[in-house]
């Protein structure tokens, strides 16, 4: 279990740390003001008590100030994501100060040692902020700390220790090991800034969770459930690098949080929206696509400040690469009767036809089971903007795809050899767009034909009432 009491080992050892030797030139924590998008450009180094670099490097006291905080490192050098983030911030916020917090000497350690250094690094950042606050026109409210992995908790400590309250902290997949279940002051928490937003992309409920599972901000966003990220499977990784390993998969999923944030900066015309939901399963069912009462928000840089009494867990689906935006739809299918369903769940697919484009054939994921004489809700999402929906094709897949289903079908046949054909009756499908919040009802093309069976399809067209809004507000992008 972790060494009690923090950065330099045990609490009681704190007052007896050896002083830095004379030969030690480089401080353990450096503040690099990035004056150019070019990663090769050295920028300027800021240090507490030295005002000259602020003037020499045109530090803008009235502008936004971003502090980018890296995490644990195995290589001891800056990774590519950091340069991309610096560049994206410069592109989006031309006048802003972008400061890279370089704590590589303290992060390039055993993970447990790096964890035990987070408090001291957070304290260094707080001291820098306290010093900057002494300058005219500098406001903590304009400070945005962006921390990746272990860096997210460093940002938490900085926000905790600073005299006053920083404007915003963004946690990009905050580290999990040694922080899961930790005390509120020992990890990133909503108390650390006026607004704390978090992206979770590598959480696992089994095995080691590299990212923290529990919510630690005002809003905690779990793209794709916060675990398996599209484009990060072993196959994808093997295809894109010479020697794909499980390490690359971990890096891909963990780092996805950074790329989602970068995407929100550079593709502000294609914002991704997340929807409040109690858990991933309910979201997968399509239950949570509401924007009422602040239940949806843009993700990343464009997130609207929300300070709920209780933490808000939010979910969304994404594409495998930039731009990550997808279009979410809730599909409510009322099954009013079915015949001879047997043991196995049907496999349904839908194809959506719109004024702009048609979707691919999309599977309807059955999270639990199809309920009879009930409304069954599903989530589907498309990578392209279909425009206004015109019609839907619902297909019941014929032959079983899995050996398990085939076996169940065979067993079902043995017990009821003269089992007549399975059949389901559906009159209408109600669709709600997550992105526009518009609702539409689709009716079967032929009102007399509402049944569907394996290997068959059913077509639905817009019912007469057309699109309607139901006191729902659509998600709006509030550009900072």
């Amino acid at each position: 279990s972790p060494v009690p009491f923090g950065p330099e080992g045990r609490l009681e050892d704190k007052l007896h740390k050896p002083k830095a030797t004379q030969t030690e030139v480089k401080p353990s924590v450096r503040f690099n003001l990035r004056t150019s998008k070019d990663p090769e450009h050295e920028g300027c180094y800021l240090s507490v008590g030295h005002s000259q670099p602020l003037e020499d490097c045109s530090f803008n006291m009235t502008a936004k100030t971003f502090f980018i905080i890296h995490g644990w490192t195995m290589s001891g050098i800056f990774e590519n994501w950091l340069h991309k983030l610096v560049s994206a911030l410069h592109t989006r916020e031309k006048d802003a100060n972008v400061v890279v917090v370089d704590w590589l000497p303290l992060a390039h350690q055993l993970y447990t040692d790096a964890v035990n250094n987070t408090r001291v690094v957070g304290h260094s950042i707080a001291r820098m902020l306290d010093w900057l606050q002494e300058k005219d026109d500098f406001s903590l409210g304009n400070v945005h700390l962006i921390g990746y992995s272990l860096g997210a908790h460093v940002a938490g400590y900085a926000g905790n220790f600073v005299k006053g309250t920083v404007g915003r902290i963004t946690g990009l997949d905050p580290a999990g090991p040694m922080f899961e279940g930790a005390d509120i002051h020992k990890r990133l928490s909503p108390d650390d800034a006026d607004f704390v937003d978090v992206l979770h992309t590598y959480t696992r409920s089994f095995g080691l969770s590299i990212g923290i599972q529990m919510p630690v901000g005002h809003i905690d966003i779990y793209p794709n459930g916060g675990d398996f990220q599209p484009g990060c499977g072993l196959n994808d990784v093997l295809g894109s690098i010479a020697y794909g390993t499980i390490t690359e998969v971990v890096k891909c999923e963990h780092e996805r949080a950074v790329h989602l944030f970068v995407d929100s900066l550079v593709n502000q015309d294609k914002p991704s929206f997340a929807f409040q939901c109690t858990d991933s399963n309910r979201f997968k069912k399509g239950i949570c696509l509401s924007c009422r009462k602040n239940r949806c928000n843009s993700i990343g840089y464009n997130a609207k400040k929300m300070r709920n009494k209780r933490n808000s867990k939010m979910y969304l689906k994404t594409r495998a690469g930039m731009p990550f935006r997808v279009y979410h739809y809730q599909m409510k299918i009322h099954v009013f009767s079915y015949k001879n369903m047997g043991e196995i769940e049907p496999t349904f697919y839908v194809t959506l036809y719109g004024t702009n484009a048609d979707s691919q054939t999309l599977p309807l994921e059955i999270v639990e089971r199809i309920e009879q004489n009930a409304t069954n809700t599903f989530l589907v999402y498309t990578e392209e903007d279909l425009g206004d929906l015109l019609k839907i094709q619902l297909t019941w897949e014929g032959a079983s795809q899995s050996w398990y289903n085939l076996w169940k079908e065979f067993r079902s046949y043995l017990s009821q050899p003269r089992n007549p054909g399975r059949e389901l009756n559906i009159r209408r499908i109600r669709v709600k767009s997550g992105e526009t919040q518009r609702k539409l009802t689709f009716c079967t093309e032929d009102p007399e034909n509402t049944s569907i069976s394996p290997g068959r399809e059913l077509w639905f067209r817009k019912c007469r009432d057309g699109w309607r809004m139901k006191n729902e507000t659509s998600p709006t992008v509030e550009l900072p």
Epitope: K163, A182, D183
Partner: antibody
Framework: QVQLVQSGAEVKKPGASVKVSCKAS????????IAWVRQAPGQGLEWMGE????????KYNKKFKGRVTMTRDTSTSTVYMELSSLRSEDTAVYYC?????????WGQGTTVTVSS | DIQMTQSPSSLSASVGDRVTITCKAS??????VAWYQQKPGKSPKLLIY???YRFTGVPSRFSGSGAGTDFTLTISSLQPEDFATYYC?????????FGGGTKVEIK
């Protein structure tokens, strides 16, 4: 080693105020939150609030909001808890505790008796 | 505020017994729960933090488990020095809240 040493017992009249001190040693005083927890006779533990000595940030239990004030003196590594408008139900043992993994280390407690 | 409900409020056990104390949170606190031991006239002592991690110097007979809203403190083989009152506390959010306590007495 880490030590939290509290001031001695107090007897106060209803309506008065009490100020209890907690002197810390053996660790970096400014960077760990110190909480105040009280325990009425025969009762459980009740969190009153906490202070971060470095920045003097405080968090209070709203039950005591307006009656409790937590301060610190970094030169002597001491935190103070003042409770005003005392009533008989404030009779309790008051503990200070330093937080890291949990309330890792506690003071010995200060008995405050409120009686007319 | 998050309420922490402990049960039982008291129990009688013998040396060598396995003792289990439970704590229920009114809302999800994930694994942000600590357990304390308090002997009469003494200050509380931290036993377990983050639901299942033993604090420095705590004997291995003490173990914690649970996540979400349900938590358990187990003493695998009760020793004479373990007769005390035990408290759970959530440290997920402010205000920090304690359970009502469980007094472990000699049978």
């Amino acid at each position: 080693q880490v030590q939290l040493v509290q001031s001695g017992a107090e007897v106060k009249k209803p309506g008065a105020s009490v100020k209890v001190s907690c002197k810390a040693s053996g660790y970096t005083f400014t960077t760990y939150w110190i909480a105040w927890v009280r325990q009425a006779p025969g009762q459980g533990l009740e969190w009153m609030g906490e202070i971060l000595p470095g920045s003097a940030k405080t968090k209070y239990n709203k039950k005591f909001k307006g009656r409790v004030t937590m301060t610190r003196d970094t030169s002597t590594s001491t935190v103070y808890m003042e409770l005003s408008s005392l009533r008989s139900e404030d009779t309790a043992v008051y503990y200070c505790a330093v937080y890291d993994y949990g309330a890792d280390y506690w003071g010995q407690g200060t008995t405050v008796t409120v009686s007319s | 505020d998050i309420q922490m409900t402990q049960s039982p409020s008291s129990l009688s056990a013998s040396v060598g017994d396995r003792v289990t104390i439970t704590c229920k949170a009114s809302q999800d606190v994930y694994t942000a729960v600590a357990w304390y031991q308090q002997k009469p006239g003494k200050s509380p002592k931290l036993l377990i933090y983050s639901a299942s991690y033993r604090f420095t110097g705590v004997p291995s007979r003490f173990s914690g488990s649970g996540a979400g809203t349900d938590f358990t403190l187990t003493i695998s083989s009760l020793q004479p020095e373990d007769f005390a009152t035990y408290y759970c506390q959530q440290h997920y959010s402010i205000p920090r809240t304690f359970g009502g306590g469980t007094k472990v007495e000699i049978k």
